[in-house]
């Protein structure tokens, strides 16, 4: 039968190539059975994950899963890095895998690399 533990569906070693200046929503898909857990986002700094206190977040509910969303409006160059969501459930802390944002700081739309170029060039960081 289905587990009633909270599960956080962020893929291990997942990456997103995004453009500075664009809006972006980072989703933490959350599966739970009864009461929705308290979920937070943090940003990795070395081995510690620093809680993101003053950032805009929201919930999106779907039939079988909920999404805790971290909003970037807009994406800034220093948003580059790895993020993790965590859920508090019955006094347990459940942590997701980390997901990495690669932010490309492009000056004009004409200079923007294609999605395929960005996917294969994660060294284009600022």
């Amino acid at each position: 039968k289905e587990s009633c533990d909270v599960q956080l569906y962020i893929k291990r070693q997942s990456e997103h190539s995004i453009l500075a200046g664009d809006p972006f929503e980072l989703e933490c898909p959350v599966k739970y059975c009864a009461n929705r857990p308290h979920v937070t986002w943090c940003k990795l700094n070395g081995t510690t994950c620093v809680k993101l206190e003053d950032r805009q977040t929201s919930w999106k509910e779907e039939k079988n899963i909920s999404f805790f969303i971290l909003h970037f409006e807009p994406v800034l160059p220093n948003d580059n890095g790895s993020y993790r969501c965590s859920a508090n459930f019955q006094s347990n802390l459940i942590e997701s895998h980390s997901t990495t944002l690669y932010v490309t700081d492009v000056k004009s739309a004409s200079e923007r690399p294609s999605k395929d170029e960005m996917a294969s060039r994660p060294w284009l960081l600022y």
């Epitope: 599960q7 291990r12 070693q13 997103h16 996917a119």
Partner: antibody, heavy 119, light 112 residues
Framework: EVQLVQSGAEVKKPGESLKISCKTS????????IHWVRQMPGKGLEWIGR????????KYSPSFQGQVTISADKSISTAYLQLSSLKASDTAMYYC????????????WGQGTLVTVSS | DVVMTQSPLSLPVTLGQPASISCRSS???????????LNWLQQRPGQSPRRLIY???KRDSGVPDRFSGSGSGTDFTLKISRVEAEDVGVYYC?????????FGQGTKLEIK
């Protein structure tokens, strides 16, 4: 039933290009990473790269970077491996594999596509 | 790149006897999430590979319990408690902790 069905065997000439497909069913392709692996005749397995069908992000082995393009169309649950400027040394069996991305709970392999490059 | 070294490369075994394959990695496969991403694959003659073991010791569904995986860090072992005829083929270890992911050279298991 879980299936990864790859396109059929191909015979190509040097310099030509080729796109192999891997049609998945029985699971949600967005929950997985699709890997591509090469096996040259009588040899071992070599990791080419992987694609995240959920967002299109792709990672390549440096040994294959620039020689291949990996992609996926999540709307039809199909992954692709494109080989360009084929050489005789590209003759090999190419496998797709689908691994669950969250907890590694499954890892399925396609039946392989034999590519022969010969003038 | 992480180099995966298997031994032996050839393993003749008598039916019903145990078999053991070693896999060593050139660096630790322990990921920052505390898990170790080491898989064992079986490739029977003329077939595509099949995952037997993941996360060092977890058996895939449908894999007989005579197969077991163990190890940590850089040193891993696949054991078959009693070899059967259907176990003939090549066994590969595969790490997916560090990019690029890498395979061992393969160990060919044959019946004596």
């Amino acid at each position: 039933e879980v299936q990864l069905v790859q396109s059929g065997a191909e015979v190509k000439k040097p310099g030509e290009s080729l796109k192999i497909s891997c049609k998945t069913s029985g699971f949600n392709i967005k929950d997985t990473y699709i890997h591509w692996v090469r096996q040259m005749p009588g040899k071992g397995l070599e990791w080419i790269g992987r694609n995240d069908p959920a967002n299109g992000n792709t990672k390549y082995s440096p040994s294959f970077q620039g020689q291949v393009t990996i992609s996926a169309d999540k709307s039809i649950s199909t992954a692709y491996l494109q080989l360009s400027s084929l050489k005789a040394s590209d003759t090999a069996m190419y496998y797709c594999a689908s691994y669950e991305g969250y907890y590694e709970r499954f890892g399925y392999w396609g039946q392989g596509t034999l590519v022969t490059v010969s003038s | 790149d992480v180099v995966m070294t298997q031994s032996p490369l050839s393993l003749p075994v008598t039916l019903g006897q145990p078999a053991s394959i070693s896999c060593r990695s050139s660096q630790s496969l322990l990921d920052r999430d505390g898990k170790t991403y080491l898989n064992w694959l079986q490739q029977r003659p003329g077939q595509s590979p099949r995952r037997l073991i993941y996360l060092v010791s977890k058996r895939d569904s449908g894999v007989p319990d005579r197969f077991s995986g163990s190890g940590s860090g850089t040193d891993f072992t696949l054991k078959i408690s009693r070899v059967e005829a259907e176990d003939v083929g090549v066994y590969y270890c595969w790490q997916d902790t560090h990019f690029p992911y890498t395979f061992g050279q393969g160990t060919k298991l044959e019946i004596k």
